[in-house]
Interface confidence: low
């Protein structure tokens, strides 16, 4: 479907005469008849197979024809056709004189013809006008013509129908040759297939509209490139869906057992060093001046009894100060002005002269110590508590505060590692010297019997069309990850083909 357009530009009839040579009275009121037909080697009378069109009176004798297309007028003249343009044509243009207002052929005298031209040739569809001029003895006609396609028709012969659309059946505009040009974000033969978000995983993601990325079962993330770990997986990751591979420092079926308490909880205070010593078990090595299981207690600097020879210790903001008894001096009352003659040894200690009597030394009875036997022996000095236990003086006795995992008077006994019931799924626990061992019931394996081996829902290959099967450990069921083009719980149904088009 298209239109043959003829633009009349100028008609010259200087003498104002008809084809017969007779002059028009008072002048030749000129209108045109146009006949468009199939190609003829010699243009001859007969039906105007491609169409006809007539103009009103356009001028008298010689005149230029105004381009009237913008104002809805009739120049260029339109000769529509609804067939494939053959590429060749014959064109007859007749100029007639209208004595009156009735321009019908039967109302005109037979000799009212002013001139007649006939041309034929090849004409390709296109936007460019072909300019032509035909001259006879008395008249001259200048005109141009072209063939263009109707709306929604394209191609060399205006035979290709294409209507732009942006709906379920396609998202495209039409190229000059009638081929589809997809709108941004769409692809495929009919531009029905959305282009997913850049980077969306080809197998694990899909989309129903452009720049979207919807994930198939077992996958997540903006680009559907992150697998979904086992339900309940706390500190673990996966490389395929429903796995739970524990991060460093975590263990157990759901990676929720803390094997790196130091890093995850930072229990040691005041700059102490933390060492892991088993699940949820740790040891804090305190900096000077601190004590307690977590080094949370600040030691008074006087607690280490720095003052000798019976000196009394006073805490100060920036340290401590020793008040020395008579006969002693120095930072720690370590220097003596006494000799054995002054009986400096307390609690029954015996005095021995040194350096020719300039100094002395006390030999203390049991349970006393100090340079003057002035201190009772601290039962914790010998550090009797094993396995990092903390010694506390309690009157005449002493007591050990044990670290987690140890018990006994001197923290010398291991608490059974099995007391925590670490074996999953009814596994039997065995205490070993340096840890524990689980004996697993049938259907389970792993260090803590955390791996289920009894039922593999994928063993029967339930997924069709090369889909990938994943076992959901929590429900003993399978999930099929379908390849592109298939749907259904087992990927058994092909996705419907795109609907056929009306052309």
């Amino acid at each position: 479907s298209g239109v043959f357009q003829l633009q009349l530009q100028e008609f010259i009839n200087e003498r104002g005469v008809l084809a017969s040579g007779r002059p028009c009275e008072p002048g030749c009121r000129t209108f045109f008849r146009v006949c468009l037909k199939h190609f003829q080697a010699v243009v001859s009378p007969g039906p105007c197979t491609f169409g006809t069109v007539s103009t009103p009176v356009l001028g008298t004798n010689s005149f230029a024809v105004r381009d009237d297309s913008s104002g809805g007028g009739r120049n260029p003249l339109q000769l529509p056709f609804n067939f494939t343009w053959p590429g060749t044509f014959s064109l007859i243009i007749e100029a007639w004189h209208a004595p009156g207002d009735d321009l019908r052929p039967e109302a005109l005298p037979p000799d009212a013809l002013i001139s007649k031209i006939a041309i034929q040739g090849s004409l390709a569809v296109g936007q460019n006008w072909l300019l032509d001029e035909q001259t006879s003895t008395l008249t001259r006609l200048r005109y141009s013509y072209r063939v263009i396609c109707s709306d929604n028709y394209y191609g060399d012969n205006c035979s290709r129908l294409c209507k732009k659309r942006n709906d379920h059946f396609g998202h495209y505009v039409c190229q000059p040759d009638g081929n589809l040009s997809c709108l941004p974000g769409w692809t495929g033969e009919y531009c029905q297939q959305p282009i997913c978000l850049s980077g969306c995983h080809e197998q694990n993601g899909y989309c129903s509209k452009p720049a979207e990325c919807l994930c198939r079962p077992g996958w997540q993330g903006r680009l559907c490139n992150e697998c979904i770990p086992h339900n309940g997986c706390r500190h673990g990751t996966c490389s395929t869906p429903w796995q739970c591979t524990c991060d460093e420092g975590w263990g157990g079926l759901f990676c929720d057992q803390d094997l790196n308490y130091c890093t995850h909880h930072s229990p040691c205070k005041n700059g102490a060093t933390c060492s892991n010593s088993g699940q949820r078990s740790y040891t804090c090595t305190c900096r000077p001046g601190y004590t307690g299981v977590d080094c949370e207690l600040e030691l008074s600097e006087c607690d280490s009894n720095p003052c000798r020879n019976g000196g009394s210790c006073k805490d100060q903001e920036d340290g401590y100060h020793c008040l020395c008894p008579p006969g002693y001096y120095g930072l720690h009352c370590e220097h003596s002005t006494l000799s054995c003659a002054d009986s400096p040894c307390f609690n029954g200690g015996s005095c021995r002269e040194r350096n020719q009597g300039a100094n002395y030394a006390c030999e203390c009875p049991p349970n006393f110590t100090g340079s003057n036997c002035e201190k009772k022996v601290d039962r914790c000095t010998s550090n009797p508590c094993a396995n990092g236990g903390q010694c506390l003086n309690r009157g005449p006795s002493r007591m050990c505060r044990c670290r987690p995992g140890f018990t006994g008077t001197y923290c010398e006994l291991h608490v059974s590692d099995c007391a925590r019931n670490p074996c999953a799924h009814g596994g039997t626990c065995h205490d070993l010297e340096n840890g524990l061992m689980c004996t697993c019931p049938a259907g389970f394996s792993g260090r803590r019997c955390e791996v289920r081996t009894s039922i593999d829902a994928c063993a029967s290959s339930p997924c069709f069309n090369r889909a990938t099967c994943y076992t959901d450990l929590s429900t003993d069921t399978f999930v099929c990850n379908c390849p592109y083009g298939f749907v259904g719980s087992r990927c058994e149904f092909p996705v419907g083909l795109p609907p056929s088009f009306p052309w």
């Epitope: 997809c182 941004p184 974000g185 692809t187 282009i195 850049s198 980077g199 452009p210 720049a211 903006r222």
Partner: antibody
Framework: QVQLKESGPGLVQPSETLSLTCTVS????????VNWVRQPPGKGLEWMGR???????SHNSALNSRLNISRDTSKNQVFLKMNSLQTEDPGTYFC??????????????WGQGTSVTVSS | DIVLTQSPALAVSLGQRATISCRAS??????????MQWYQQKPGHQPKLLVY???NLASGIPARFSGSGSGTDFALTIDPVQADDVATYHC?????????FGGGTKLELK
């Protein structure tokens, strides 16, 4: 009409944190992505990161550990926080809207930029 | 990351045609789409989008500007060049994360 405006301190000390705000009008943050792009003096443009229409964020991995991008849709604001500022971080920082959430439509509206200097 | 290479400067006469090129280290095409944008930036101003998806003119941009290319080789053409076109022109790809920009080409008048 569509407008974006960056604001924040012009001077930041080395190793301190840069905090910028992009206030938008004329469009909804729940329909369009907003990007942060910076330009060192006399140099080219560097994409830093974006907050998507659904609130998801993505960063340039070269800045990932230092960068945090967030938004408050009720206030029509997008925020950029970058810690441990270094001597190579000064420049003009732009926020830019990404057309209709599709990356192939480009960044069709930009703020006028805010200049950041790193100096003690 | 995809690296975009532009020549630093280009000098043309008023009224002539200017062609600014941008080469990508790998293809920036998805299906039939070439995810390459062009921006104009005048001194002291923010960038302005000229062309998206390699050949689509952004809203309000005069037809003197046009974009072309596919795969790894792209060009921005200004024909004819006017005095107001003196600026730096940046190409930007949005196919892969992270989006990257070229170093910019400074257009100067001869």
């Amino acid at each position: 009409q569509v407008q974006l405006k960056e604001s924040g301190p012009g001077l930041v000390q080395p190793s301190e944190t840069l905090s910028l705000t992009c206030t938008v009008s004329g469009f909804s943050l729940t329909r369009y992505a907003v990007n942060w792009v910076r330009q060192p003096p006399g140099k080219g443009l560097e994409w830093m990161g974006r907050v998507m229409d659904d609130g998801d964020t993505s960063h340039n991995s070269a800045l990932n550990s230092r960068l945090n991008i967030s938004r408050d849709t009720s206030k029509n604001q997008v925020f950029l926080k970058m810690n441990s500022l270094q001597t190579e971080d000064p420049g003009t920082y732009f926020c830019a809207r990404e057309g209709d959430g599709f990356s192939w439509y480009g960044m069709d509206a930009w703020g006028q930029g805010t200049s950041v200097t790193v100096s003690s | 990351d995809i690296v975009l290479t532009q020549s630093p400067a280009l000098a043309v006469s008023l009224g002539q045609r200017a062609t600014i090129s941008c080469r990508a280290s790998q293809s920036v095409s998805i299906s039939s789409y070439n995810l390459m944008q062009w921006y104009q930036q005048k001194p002291g101003h923010q960038p302005k989008l000229l062309v998206y998806a390699a050949s689509n003119l952004a809203s309000g941009i005069p037809a003197r500007f046009s974009g072309s290319g596919s795969g790894t080789d792209f060009a921005l053409t200004i024909d004819p060049v006017q005095a107001d076109d003196v600026a730096t022109y940046h190409c930007q790809q949005s196919k892969d994360h992270p989006p990257t920009f070229g170093g910019g080409t400074k257009l100067e008048l001869k």
